[in-house]
């Protein structure tokens, strides 16, 4: 009856049709499962835990970028429940490679100990 319902659809026994799973709002993530024709009885949305964010819809909350610990960069904008953190310039003692393609996380800062001579962030 419902084998053709989509990834984010459940089968509504009242209408005989697939129906969109209720999407979550920004700062929320789905609790339990809904999709491909089925929906858990207690399916709903719950707020993102601390240090995580979500744009809403059906995505789970993701951890904020760790600007200082992972990227060795300053925090330009701290993340909240609805938005990821934004990283700023490198921390003191670190530099960013010029013309280096961004990886999936953005730009990564490297230790001045490994820098070529006269790298501007590392001079002085």
């Amino acid at each position: 009856e419902y084998s053709n319902c989509g990834e984010n659809e459940y089968y509504n026994q009242t209408t005989g049709l697939c129906q969109e799973c209720p999407p979550c709002g920004p700062g929320e993530e789905p609790y339990l499962s809904c999709g491909y024709g089925t929906k858990d009885e207690d399916y709903g949305c719950v707020p993102c835990p601390a240090e995580k964010f979500s744009k809403g819809g059906y995505q789970i909350c993701r951890r904020h970028k760790d600007c200082e610990g992972f990227f060795r960069a300053t925090v330009l904008t701290p993340g909240d429940m609805e938005n990821d953190a934004e990283c700023g310039p490198c921390l003191p003692g670190y530099y960013m490679l010029e013309n280096r393609p961004r990886n999936i996380y953005g730009m990564v800062c490297y230790s001045c100990l490994l820098a070529p001579p006269n790298t501007k962030e590392c001079v002085g």
Epitope: E1, N4, Y11, T15, G16, L17, C18, Q19, E20
Partner: antibody
Framework: EVQLQQSGPELVKPGASVKMSCKAS????????MHWVKQSHGKSLEWIGY????????SKNQKFKGKATLTVDKSSTTAYIQLNSLTSEDSAVYYC??????????????WGAGTTVTVSS | DVVMTQTPLSLPVSLGDQASISCRSS???????????LHWYLQQPGQSPKLLIY???NRFSGVPDRFSGSGSGTDFTLKISRVEAEDLGVYFC?????????FGAGTKLELK
């Protein structure tokens, strides 16, 4: 009297898009799902999908997921279907149909007159 | 998707004749709720389809009693006891037990 009034015929070029309307009257617009059905050149009928005018939620036949966009304007009690990247395969009559689901019945009880779409260069 | 097969595709009749149209589905149309969602629609020339019979055998409001539906599981029949001129057109069976809803290819009822 319950009526579904559809927009007039469309002649469109391949690759273009088209948006058709279905104006509902004589009943509570948000109380019934609105479905869209395709009929190619007097042949059989194909279910495209539906929209719930109450909340705008939609569900579509897998075959039309990249082709059709369904929307509503509650203030004017009008449903819309937009078809994109048109090819000759999209030349057809498109019907809107009201869906009844009281008492576990589930059928199309009122149909619009249809909009003829011709895709030609 | 559930395939609906109608026979015949064309049915020549004389006014006053009995007519019978068959519809077979590729899967059982008995829903888990116990209902069988097999409907019949008539499309008269130049018009949109109109509901005639819902859930196998229930006549929709305003449909004359010369129309009757029967069947179960995967095999269904629409009968017209005495064909009148206004009955001419294309008859479609349709299932709404499974998603997506599907229709038969249609049977054209026409004068001999």
């Amino acid at each position: 009297e319950v009526q579904l009034q559809q927009s007039g015929p469309e002649l469109v070029k391949p690759g273009a898009s088209v948006k058709m309307s279905c104006k509902a009257s004589g009943y509570s617009f948000t109380g019934y799902n609105m479905h869209w059905v395709k009929q190619s050149h007097g042949k059989s009928l194909e279910w495209i999908g539906y929209i719930d005018p109450y909340n705008g939620a939609t569900s579509k036949n897998q075959k039309f997921k990249g082709k059709a966009t369904l929307t509503v304007d509650k203030s004017s009690t009008t449903a819309y279907i937009q078809l994109n990247s048109l090819t000759s395969e999209d030349s057809a009559v498109y019907y809107c149909a009201r869906y009844y689901y009281g008492d576990y019945h589930w059928y199309f009880d009122v149909w619009g007159a249809g909009t003829t779409v011709t895709v030609s260069s | 998707d559930v395939v609906m097969t109608q026979t015949p595709l064309s049915l020549p009749v004389s006014l006053g004749d009995q007519a019978s149209i068959s519809c077979r589905s590729s899967q059982s149309l008995v829903h888990s709720n116990g209902n069988t969602y097999l409907h019949w629609y008539l499309q008269q020339p130049g018009q949109s389809p109109k509901l005639l019979i819902y859930k196998v055998s229930n006549r929709f409001s305003g449909v004359p009693d010369r129309f009757s539906g029967s069947g179960s599981g995967t095999d269904f029949t629409l009968k017209i006891s005495r064909v009148e001129a206004e009955d001419l057109g294309v008859y479609f069976c349709s299932q709404h037990t499974h998603v997506p809803p599907t229709f038969g290819a249609g049977t054209k009822l026409e004068l001999k």
